[in-house]
């Protein structure tokens, strides 16, 4: 990640800026926590403080947005369920996967149901 400039250029009293384009929130250290977002409008630039939550994985953060299917059925063997996400929008310079798979543990209730189904199938 390129280091952002600390100075803030502001237009003179008569300057008007209709549309600011804001870049991503870039954490000051590592890949989460407090950082800065840089905005540009014409020749002006501004930096504002922002925060990237540390429980977000980078690929699921603001850089890459996905549209997710519903969760699949619980896999009794692994105790997990899966859903697929298709890329909806990426930050211009973010090299996002076109599709991603997310897994999560089944709830105890779904686990029990999946086991019961498995048991019935064996009979």
């Amino acid at each position: 990640v390129a280091k952002k400039k600390d100075k803030v250029k502001k237009g003179g009293p008569g300057s008007e800026c209709a549309e600011w384009a804001w870049g991503p929130c870039t954490p000051s250290s590592k890949d989460c926590g407090v950082g800065f977002r840089e905005g540009t409008c014409g020749a002006q630039t501004q930096r504002i403080r922002c925060r990237v939550p540390c429980n977000w994985k980078k690929e699921f953060g603001a850089d890459c947005k996905y549209k997710f299917e519903n969760w699949g059925a619980c896999d009794g063997g692994t105790g997990t369920k899966v859903r697929q996400g298709t890329l909806k929008k990426a930050r211009y310079n973010a090299q996002c996967q076109e599709t991603i798979r997310v897994t999560k543990p089944c709830t105890p209730k779904t686990k029990a149901k999946a086991k019961a189904k498995k048991g019935k199938g064996k009979d």
């Epitope: 990640v1 390129a2 384009a21 870049g23 840089e38 540009t40 298709t86 890329l87 909806k88 929008k89 990426a90 211009y92 310079n93 973010a94 090299q95 996002c96 996967q97 076109e98």
Partner: antibody, heavy 117, light 107 residues
Framework: QVQLQQPGAELVRPGHSVKLSCKAS????????MNWVRQRPGQGLEWIGM????????ILNQKFKDKATLTVDISSNTAYMQLSSPTSEDSAVYFC??????????WGQGTTLTVSS | EIVLTQSPATLSLSPGERANLSCRAS??????LHWYQQKPHQAPRLLIK???QSISGIPARFSGSGPGTDFNLTISSVEPEDFAVYYC?????????FGGGTKLEIK
């Protein structure tokens, strides 16, 4: 792979606005930024602006803020650029291109716009 | 806006020679620099993205270097089909800007 189709040529009278189209086929149109680029005869490339079909977020080169309006129609997988009050200065080839930082980009063949009475 | 200066404006080489094209940015743009090839009456074609990342379907003789302010596109051994105009483009900040181009011509 994305294919982008643009009309080969458009003729418009000075002062009459014109809407250029860019129709996408192939992979998902709505996931990628659509750029518009101008190339005047014998000149280099000039970025006009871009739009994201998923939410119509638009970033426009300030130089074109009073000239170009970018829109998309998701139902027909088509991006549009409307040029207001065209003059002979706007006679150029206009390209659209679909950008993905991961895979690169795909370009239309360009529309030659002639502004003439 | 970020200004990209390409040099030389024209490069005259014979097939088989090595080509070095330069692109200098007016400020640091990290690795957000891309190279395009354009032939007459055709759309530009992406050769290299993010300073040095190769593109599927582009011959291995094309390579790029960066990041920072000074970038280079190298064609290790020029082929007859490589004679064209080459543009660099930055995507570090809006507006996106292109260099003025380098014309690679047959000597």
């Amino acid at each position: 792979q994305v294919q982008l189709q643009q009309p080969g040529a458009e003729l418009v009278r000075p002062g009459h606005s014109v809407k250029l189209s860019c129709k996408a086929s192939g992979q998902s149109f709505s996931s990628y930024w659509m750029n518009w680029v101008r190339q005047r005869p014998g000149q280099g490339l000039e970025w006009i602006g871009m739009i994201h079909p998923s939410d119509s977020e638009t970033i426009l080169n300030q130089k074109f803020k009073d000239k170009a309006t970018l829109t998309v129609d998701i139902s027909s997988n088509t991006a549009y650029m409307q040029l207001s009050s065209p003059t002979s200065e706007d006679s150029a080839v206009y390209f659209c291109s679909s950008w993905s930082a991961k895979r690169g980009d795909f370009w239309g063949q360009g529309t030659t716009l002639t502004v003439s009475s | 806006e970020i200004v990209l200066t390409q040099s030389p404006a024209t490069l005259s080489l014979s097939p088989g020679e090595r080509a070095n094209l330069s692109c200098r940015a007016s400020e640091s743009i990290s690795n957000n620099l891309h190279w395009y090839q354009q032939k007459p009456h055709q759309a530009p074609r992406l050769l290299i993205k993010y300073a040095s990342q190769s593109i599927s379907g582009i011959p291995a003789r094309f390579s790029g270097s960066g990041p920072g302010t000074d970038f280079n596109l190298t064609i290790s051994s020029v082929e007859p089909e490589d004679f064209a105009v080459y543009y660099c483009q930055q995507s570090n900040s809006w507006p996106l800007t292109f260099g003025g181009g380098t014309k690679l011509e047959i000597k």
